[in-house]
């Protein structure tokens, strides 16, 4: 087929999809034109496995990523629950436009959020001390709408300060008790989430939380002192 005479713009370069926790963000490098005073705009389209291409606009996906001057499209900008369903096979494509001119489409490799996501550490970690125990509470890296499809399990990496690291888990609960610790000792810990997607038997190991340390309480039978 003869080349499209209107397809004379350079295509956006180095598009990247960021899938971090619930975020779904497409970004790219700007198309620079030295001989134009008008801004280059961009259009993003998406498709599912057997669907046609849809323009990424408010009606279709809840965000406007057509005729935009920005060099990113955040599909989850409206809310963390917005964006593409996490178990859908999604393909994105992108082009630059200037008046009647446009670039060729740049098509990204397909993704599934659960398959490709980078899982961050558990958040809001709070620890309550006991005598020879630490109760650890935290929230999930992100919310999963249907926990029969995918779910988190958790591991705690812990060690007596200056000692050998141990791992406890997996747990399904957002509350974990480390028992059989020594009283009046300092223990350090990190919590880690692992995302399991039942459908494809896929699991994504998450980042460790920052190290934090906690003193267990003295034996409860001893008299309390300042």
């Amino acid at each position: 087929a003869p080349p499209d005479p209107l397809s004379q713009l350079p295509a956006p370069q180095h598009p990247k999809i960021r899938l971090y926790n619930a975020e779904q963000v497409l970004s790219w490098e700007p198309v620079a034109l030295s001989n134009s005073t008008r801004p280059v705009v961009y259009q993003v389209q998406f498709k599912y496995t057997d669907s046609k291409w849809f323009t990424a606009d408010i009606m279709s996906i809840g965000v406007n990523c057509t005729q935009i001057t920005a060099t990113e499209c955040d599909f989850t900008a409206a809310s963390p629950s917005a964006g593409f369903p996490m178990d859908f096979n999604v393909t994105l494509r992108l082009r630059a436009e200037l008046g009647a001119l446009h670039s060729a489409w740049v098509t990204m490799p397909w993704f599934q959020h659960y398959r490709n996501v980078t899982v961050g550490p558990p958040e809001n970690i709070e620890v309550t001390p006991g005598e020879g125990s630490l109760i650890i509470r935290f929230s999930s890296p992100f919310d999963i709408a249907d926990t029969s499809t995918a779910f988190f399990c958790y591991y705690v990496h812990y060690w007596e300060k200056g000692g050998i690291q141990q791992v406890k888990g997996p747990f399904r609960s957002n509350s974990i008790s480390l028992d059989n610790l020594k009283p009046s000792r300092v223990y350090c810990l990190q919590v880690q989430a692992q995302l399991l997607w039942n459908k494809s038997n896929i699991f994504r190991v998450g980042h460790l939380s920052n190290i934090s340390c906690y003193e267990t309480m003295a034996d409860a039978s001893t008299e309390l002192q300042q």
């Epitope: 709070e126 001390p129 300092v186 920052n210 190290i211 340390c213 906690y214 003193e215």
Partner: nanobody, 123 residues
């Protein structure tokens, strides 16, 4: 150094009410949680109530529905409102704060205690 100063306590009749308060001061980077423990003569120390920064409360079964813990984070102060007091609530009540002083390589929470205040429930 971290200091916990307790206020309140005393003698109260069964069914009566008391409020304890506890203010933390000193080199405090973070406190989480703050709470109250008690120790009756010849008994082991027990948790009465605890409150985390995210608002997660823990109560001993024996005080649920009667005691309420609250906290003023800006003042590093924790309160214990005790209603419908019973003779078995008689004990020395200790304020507890889990404090990170910011003086370690990583956040490190250590146990600090108030001086204790006697609550006596008797007719």
């Amino acid at each position: 150094q971290v200091q916990l100063q307790q206020f309140g306590g005393g003698l109260v009749q069964p069914g009566g009410s008391l409020t304890l308060s506890c203010a933390a001061s000193g080199s405090i980077f973070s406190i989480n949680p703050m709470g109250w423990y008690r120790q009756a003569p010849g008994k082991r120390r027990e948790l009465v109530a605890s409150l985390t920064n995210r608002g997660i409360t823990t109560y001993a079964d024996s005080v649920k529905g009667r005691f309420t813990i609250s906290r003023d984070n800006a003042k590093n102060t924790v309160y214990l409102q005790m209603n419908a007091l019973k003779p078995e609530d008689t004990a020395v009540y200790y304020c507890h704060a889990y404090v990170d002083t910011g003086s370690h390589e990583y956040p490190q929470y250590e146990n600090y205690w108030g001086q204790g205040t006697l609550v006596t429930v008797s007719s």
